[in-house]
């Protein structure tokens, strides 16, 4: 059976505050717990959600949380269900509202000596107590012809007189808290002797040297006085006018006329009405001088035929706000049609080529008129003057491909080579007219070229194939000086290309024929076994029908390649002793020996007193120091080849003999001792 360890209980709650309905169950099997509100399942929200098996409220809501909550537990194995006791909230709240007129039905019906009732629309639970205020001052019950009914939340004024005029507000407080009226009520009960506005002056904008008129009227019993003041508090009367208002006239009905208005007349004019009783009424109006600024420039516009485009005319700053209109060819544009004005915009729908031209935006107000032109170009799709042609270009010379087109505006031309955009560099140049120049034609320039000519209206393209007429040339040119190893097999290659496959042959420079052990096989000179006599000058000749012949001269040297007779060995030397690194090489021509120590060539002329290189190639280092340790490389070279061999040199401290060691004990390393 399911047992409730903790049941939810009814409780007080505060609107908008946290609350928790507890529910804890115990059952033999797994239990599923959910909540009901008035018999319907409660869905989790951010405001109200299950917390374990309890129901948590982040902010109690008097409308959504009113009703009966019940916790339901279901044993998932047996299906048994148990329900908790019902629980509900006693929600305490207070909510602000306006002060409204309850009696009479409308403000227009409020007359002196009638009863006026105001209601305070602040509500809450428990019912709050109310306090009324006039112009911020508390009103106490039963004083000065008014009564407060807390039950109905009403304030009654009987009878209402001018002394009750003012701003009425209310506040209410309860156990939950306090609230004041969200909107207050202004009660205005006229006193006949107070000045009342009949006609208030309005702001005026006038052009320079024009006239301006302000109207102003008050009424009262007896009639009120009326006075005009300018900004600096100078009174304006027909008898005494300030110097800068010589052309001002005050009429019997209170109107003020200013003629030939100048900039110094601009400013605030005050009309003051004073009744026999009550405060003066001050009404203000401003005289502005009309003005208009210059218009910003338009950028020229390029549009495409068939599209719809808009050009916005920003009106210049001005007072009053300038009116704006568009003209074309001296005619004002209509407000509908294919080319028309909409607001401040020029609209061109389904643009035609004939729409191109100058359009003018006009702006005008009392201060004058301004205009600004915009040049509209209607773009056309390019057409061909000369397409690129399939071309034969000579290798090594400049080559040209044409792409001549015309359109409005001037078209942009781009070139592609094998579908890749050609960017201008030292080899390619695109002229203003669209022609492509290839500065020095290479064999691999033989491919497809495509030019595209574009305007905003569209593009056209054409392609052409370039065939490169190859030069007759050696590929690669043979090395002018080459070595062959004595008594070994050797080959000397020579190859060439041209418009036609060239024939290649070798001959000796002196014109003598090649010995029988030397063969010329398709341009490769082959020596079966090199002899001393094979040294000399040879010529490789490449020729074809259309391009004639070319020659390359090669001097062949026969050499005995370098071998080392003596190579340096790994050497360990006591600090302060002398190190000897031996190196001897043989070959023909006789090799020269150089040493490299610690990644730098040891220049024999700059070795210093501690180092010396012997004629036979050996390197000696006197008074060795730890910094002499490292790898030493012996490099043997002649005009035909180069070989190197290396060995490490270790410099160590001389050990101090220990008692236990006999006088004849050997050192711990293989040493050179000097």
């Amino acid at each position: 059976a399911i047992v409730f360890i903790k049941q939810p209980s009814s409780q007080d709650a505060l609107q908008g505050r946290r609350a928790l309905l507890r529910c804890e169950v115990e059952a033999p099997g797994p239990v599923h717990v959910y909540w009901l509100l008035d018999g319907a399942p409660v869905q989790d929200t951010e405001r109200r959600f299950a917390q374990g098996s309890s129901l948590s409220f982040a902010a109690v809501d008097r409308l959504q949380d009113s009703g009966t909550f019940q916790c339901v537990a279901r044993d998932d194995v047996t299906g048994e269900e148990a329900r908790s006791a019902n629980a509900s909230f006693n929600i305490k709240w207070i909510e602000a509202g306006p002060v409204v007129l309850k009696h009479p039905a409308s403000e227009a019906e409020i007359q002196p000596q009638t009863q006026v009732t105001l209601r305070c629309h602040i509500d809450g639970h428990p019912r709050p107590t109310y306090q009324w205020f006039r112009d911020g001052t508390p009103l106490s019950d039963g004083q000065s012809n008014h009564t407060v009914s807390s039950k109905e939340r009403n304030l009654t004024l009987r009878p209402a007189g001018p002394e009750h005029s003012g701003l009425y507000s209310c506040c209410a407080h309860s156990a939950f808290g306090q609230a004041c009226s969200s909107q207050n009520f202004t009660l205005s009960i006229a006193d006949e002797s107070f000045a009342r506005v009949v006609l208030a002056p309005q702001d005026v904008v006038v052009a320079r040297y024009e006239e301006a008129m302000f109207h102003c009227q008050f009424s009262a019993q007896p009639p009120p006085s009326l006075q005009w003041l300018f900004e600096d508090e100078t009174p304006i009367t027909n008898r005494s006018r300030p110097p800068h208002l010589r052309r001002a006239t005050v009429f019997a009905n209170g109107s003020l006329l200013l003629t030939q208005v100048r900039p110094r007349n601009a400013g605030i004019y005050r009309c003051i009405g004073q009744g026999q009783r009550g405060p003066p009424i001050i009404l203000e109006a401003t005289l502005h001088l009309a003005e208009i600024e210059d218009m910003p420039l338009f950028e020229p516009r390029v549009f495409t035929a068939g599209s719809e485009e808009r050009v916005t005319c920003l009106p210049p700053k001005g007072l009053p706000e300038p009116s704006v209109w568009w003209e074309h060819a001296g005619v004002r544009l209509p407000t509908h049609g294919r080319v028309y004005q909409k607001g401040h915009e020029l609209v061109l729908a389904n643009i035609a080529e004939s729409d191109a031209g100058v359009y003018t935006c006009h702006a005008a107000n009392l201060a004058g008129q301004r205009r600004q032109d915009v040049n509209i170009t209607v773009a056309t799709v390019p057409s061909w003057l000369k397409k690129p042609q399939d071309s034969q270009l000579e290798e090594g010379k400049p080559g040209y491909l044409d792409c001549l087109t015309q359109a409005t505006p001037k078209p942009t031309v781009v070139w592609y080579r094998n579908q890749m955009l050609i960017s201008e560099d030292s080899r390619f140049e695109v002229f203003k007219n669209g022609t492509l120049r290839i500065n020095s034609v290479e064999v691999y320039d033989g491919t497809w070229y495509r030019c595209m000519s574009s305007t905003p209206a569209g593009s056209i393209e054409a392609q052409a194939r370039v065939q490169v007429l190859e030069k007759l040339k050696f590929t690669p040119p043979p090395q002018p000086q080459q070595c062959m190893e004595f008594d070994k097999e050797a080959t000397v290659p020579c190859s060439a290309t041209g418009r036609e496959k060239p024939t290649i042959k070798w001959e000796r420079a002196d014109g003598s024929s090649l010995p029988e052990w030397v063969t010329d096989n398709a341009g490769t000179l082959h020596f079966a076994r090199v002899t001393r006599d094979d040294a000399g000058n040879y010529t490789c000749i490449a020729s074809n029908g259309p391009q004639g012949q070319i020659r390359a001269h090669v001097q062949l040297t026969v050499a005995v390649f370098i071998t080392f007779k003596v190579e340096p060995e790994r050497t360990t030397v006591y600090q302060g002793h002398t190190a000897l690194l031996q190196c001897e090489a043989q070959g023909d021509p006789k090799p020269l020996i150089q040493w490299k120590g610690k990644d730098r060539i040891l220049d024999p002329t700059k070795l210093g007193p501690r180092m010396h290189i012997f004629q036979n190639g050996s390197l000696v280092i006197h008074d060795v120091a730890p910094e002499d340790s490292g790898r030493y490389t012996c490099i043997a070279g002649n005009s035909c080849n180069i070989k190197h061999t290396e060995a490490p040199l270790y410099v160590v401290d001389k050990p101090v003999p220990e008692e236990s060691e006999g006088p004849g004990s050997p050192p711990p390393y293989k040493m050179i001792q000097t």
Partner: antibody
Framework: QVQLVQSGAEVKKPGASVKISCKGS????????MHWLKQAPGQGLEWIGV????????NYNQKFQGRATMTVDKSISTAYMELSRLRSDDTAVYYC??????WGQGTLVTVSS | DVQITQSPSYLSASPGDRITITCRAS??????LAWYQQKPGKANKLLIY???TLQSGVPSRFSGSGSGTEFTLTISSLQPEDFAMYYC?????????FGQGTKVEIK
């Protein structure tokens, strides 16, 4: 002893509705939740939802929300499950179960044009 | 929704064999996994719930273990009446979800 007896097999056309019943006996009907499950031919089991007969409050599997409707008639201790807008993939055996421990014998619903 | 993956789909064994069936959940379901036996023409039978609690009347050769996402059903010594379809089901949250089933056949 606890018994759940379901209504007989049904053959329906696509777009129609079917209403299956499940009568509980041998226990207090309103004190136990009733689950409904589906098993398509050669397939596993799918949970449709659960109804609490006491108030009639329900919890549906999102997959069946809007097409399945679970109700109870407390006076005759019977639970019902109606499936609307039938499709061919609704062909299955439908089970009612009191919790996980007691199952009905199942009702075969065939949807075919 | 919690996905349940059951393996193997088929299992051949002989009477007296010890067998295990595994279920894996796509997220932690604490200990709340149940095991059922299904035979044609018979009502589904609950064997184990809450991972390892034996339903009353179920022989002790059936046992369950695991928590979180990994669970197993073990039948220590298969009897002839144990050859059937077995399903696992999570009951940690609604909607209940089931494994695809394991058919235990006679070898």
């Amino acid at each position: 002893q606890v018994q759940l007896v379901q209504s007989g097999a049904e053959v329906k056309k696509p777009g129609a509705s079917v209403k299956i019943s499940c009568k509980g006996s041998g226990y207090t009907f309103t004190d136990y939740g009733m689950h409904w499950l589906k098993q398509a031919p050669g397939q596993g089991l799918e949970w449709i939802g659960v109804i609490s007969p006491y108030y009639g409050d329900v919890n549906y599997n999102q997959k069946f929300q809007g097409r399945a409707t679970m109700t109870v008639d407390k006076s005759i201790s019977t639970a019902y499950m109606e499936l609307s807008r039938l499709r061919s993939d609704d062909t299955a055996v439908y089970y009612c179960a009191r919790g996980m421990g007691y199952w009905g014998q199942g009702t075969l619903v065939t949807v075919s044009s | 929704d919690v996905q349940i993956t059951q393996s193997p789909s088929y299992l051949s064994a002989s009477p007296g064999d010890r067998i295990t069936i595994t279920c894996r959940a796509s997220q932690s379901i604490s200990k709340y996994l149940a095991w059922y036996q299904q035979k044609p023409g018979k009502a589904n039978k609950l064997l184990i719930y809450s991972g390892s609690t034996l339903q009353s009347g179920v022989p002790s050769r059936f046992s369950g273990s695991g928590s979180g996402t990994e669970f197993t059903l073990t039948i220590s010594s298969l009897q002839p009446e144990d050859f059937a379809m077995y399903y696992c089901q999570q009951h940690n949250e609604y909607p209940w979800t089931f494994g695809q089933g394991t058919k235990v056949e006679i070898k």
